[in-house]
């Protein structure tokens, strides 16, 4: 039941997805929205928060395999903690090993999501498009 | 209410999307699934049909703006009709002008979808990944 089905299977059931904010993408009961207005990381975070969401959190390659196909670069909710050298999400959880390939393209403490589960380090003050996410319960 | 919101707005309502086959993407009440098993156009069409769906039909830049961000090339349900020179969808409807930019890259009568509403002409017998779509009522 992956986004990338290897073999054709007739779906067992039709089901509803959500709830999500109106006109957001719903996939495996998570809600996603892509914003093409460029903002820095802090402004992007504030934008997501104002919509009762957070910047993208990558927590599962299986549950979020739609992210494989995302074109371009977008702010996600990953920040570098200089004091301990770790990368953590907005909710304080630490980035799990093997979830993202972190690429040190620029010097910075924030990260852009790019297709195929890559994270590009970037200066948090640089404007970029961004992805908001809302997890449904 | 676009996928690409220009200004931050608090969503008026939370809503459910669908119904869709289990674990398909739901967006603006259409269901999408990306398959990474490469098949030729005819096999891709058969795969979608077996799941009560069709190959991707692009009918609206507004309702389908999530397609702007799709990476790579995937079969869609567009075929060339040699006797009248038109491009038409599986359901027999003619491709609307200005919906897709048709790019004459290869010699063929089928088309691959690529990001930003581009259609690349390709030989129908060449294996490619594909996108299935199910429109909800």
């Amino acid at each position: 039941n992956s986004l990338f089905n290897q073999e054709v299977q007739i779906p067992l059931t039709e089901s509803y997805c959500g709830p999500c904010p109106k006109n957001w993408i719903c996939y495996k009961n998570n809600c996603y929205q892509f914003f093409n207005e460029s903002k820095n990381w802090y402004e992007s975070q504030a934008s997501c928060m104002s919509q009762n969401a957070s910047l993208l959190k990558v927590y599962s390659k299986e549950d979020q395999d739609l992210l494989k196909l995302v074109k371009s670069y977008h702010w996600m909710g990953l920040v570098h903690i200089p004091t301990n050298g770790s990368w953590q999400w907005e909710d304080g959880s630490i980035l799990s090993p093997n979830l993202l390939t972190i690429i040190e393209m620029q010097k910075g403490d924030c990260a852009l999501y790019a297709s195929s589960f890559k994270g590009y380090i970037e200066n948090c003050s640089i404007p970029n498009t961004y992805i908001c996410m809302q997890r449904t319960v | 209410n676009s996928l690409f919101n220009q200004e931050v707005q608090i969503p008026l309502t939370e809503s459910y999307c669908g119904p869709c086959p289990k674990n398909w993407i739901c967006y603006k009440n259409n269901c999408y699934q990306f398959f990474n098993e490469s098949k030729n156009w005819y096999e891709s069409q058969a795969s979608c049909m077996s799941q009560n769906a069709s190959l991707l039909k692009v009918y609206s830049k507004e309702d389908q703006d999530l397609l702007k961000l799709v990476k790579s090339y995937h079969w869609m349900g567009l075929v060339h009709i040699p006797t009248n020179g038109s491009w038409q969808w599986e359901d027999g409807s003619i491709l609307s002008p200005n919906l897709l930019t048709i790019i004459e890259m290869q010699k063929g009568d089928c088309a691959l979808y690529a990001s930003s509403f581009k259609g690349y002409i390709e030989n129908c017998s060449i294996p490619n990944t594909y996108i299935c779509m199910q429109r909800t009522v």
């Epitope: - | 060339h80 006797t83 009248n84 038109s86 790019i103 004459e104 010699k107 930003s116």
Partner: antibody, heavy 121, light 107 residues
């Protein structure tokens, strides 16, 4: 596969002319036929195109303004360009061209030899 | 209509030289760009289609590149038979438009 053109010549201002292009060696009714012109010493200028099949769909350059009309005869594998109200500015070599594949309409790999139209009193 | 601006309008070069011709579109044309060669008294000949695909039978010294609005035709080592006029043409949308041409002359 070839395109053979006919119908050029000298015409007086305000006059009309019909240029034709016969296709051979390919399935004419599945291809788009395009017309391009070139004034002496100048660049290429697209006029328009017509599908050789049952629809006879056409596209024209914005400057044509109804003075030029494309037609085709499926049985004769022929595409024609009717040019009306000719002026000196229409003096040019007129080419017909065919795309490289039947689903293409904008990329031309087969060209006629060209036919010269001279508008002069 | 999409405007196509070609540069230079003419250039002088010697046999063996590397020659580059550029073409700029007034809007993004998604790699839908063709290059043609024309010799005096002859019809144009397709060299490159879809920005970088070499037409069958065309020597490999011809190459095309570019994306968005900016495109380039390169002749890696100019041969005597390459002295001609070159045109770009956008194949993105109707009405189709050509660049003004670049005449490659013998230095």
């Amino acid at each position: 596969q070839q395109l053979e053109q006919s119908g050029g010549g000298l015409v007086t201002p305000g006059g009309s002319l019909k240029l034709c292009c016969i296709g051979s060696g390919f399935d004419f009714n599945t291809y788009w036929m395009t017309w391009v012109r070139q004034a002496p010493g100048k660049g290429l200028e697209w006029i328009g195109c017509i599908h050789g099949g049952s629809s006879g769909s056409t596209y024209y350059a914005s400057w044509v303004n109804g003075r030029f009309t494309l037609s085709r005869d499926i049985d004769q594998s022929t595409g024609c360009l009717q040019v009306n109200s000719l002026t000196a500015a229409d003096t040019a070599m007129y080419y017909c061209a065919r795309p490289g594949y039947r689903s293409w309409s904008k990329t031309f790999d087969l060209w006629g030899q060209g036919t010269m139209v001279t508008v002069s009193s | 209509d999409i405007q196509m601006t070609q540069s230079p309008s003419s250039l002088s070069a010697s046999v063996g030289d590397r020659v580059t011709i550029t073409c700029r579109a007034s809007q993004d044309i998604s790699e839908s760009l063709n290059w043609y060669q024309q010799k005096p008294g002859k019809a144009p000949k397709l060299l490159i289609y879809a920005a970088s695909s070499l037409q069958s039978g065309v020597p490999s010294r011809f190459s095309g590149s570019g994306s968005g609005t900016d495109y380039t035709l390169t002749i890696s080592s100019l041969q005597p038979e390459d002295f001609a006029t070159y045109y770009c043409q956008q194949a993105n949308s109707f009405p189709l438009t050509f660049g003004g041409g670049t005449k490659v002359e013998i230095k």
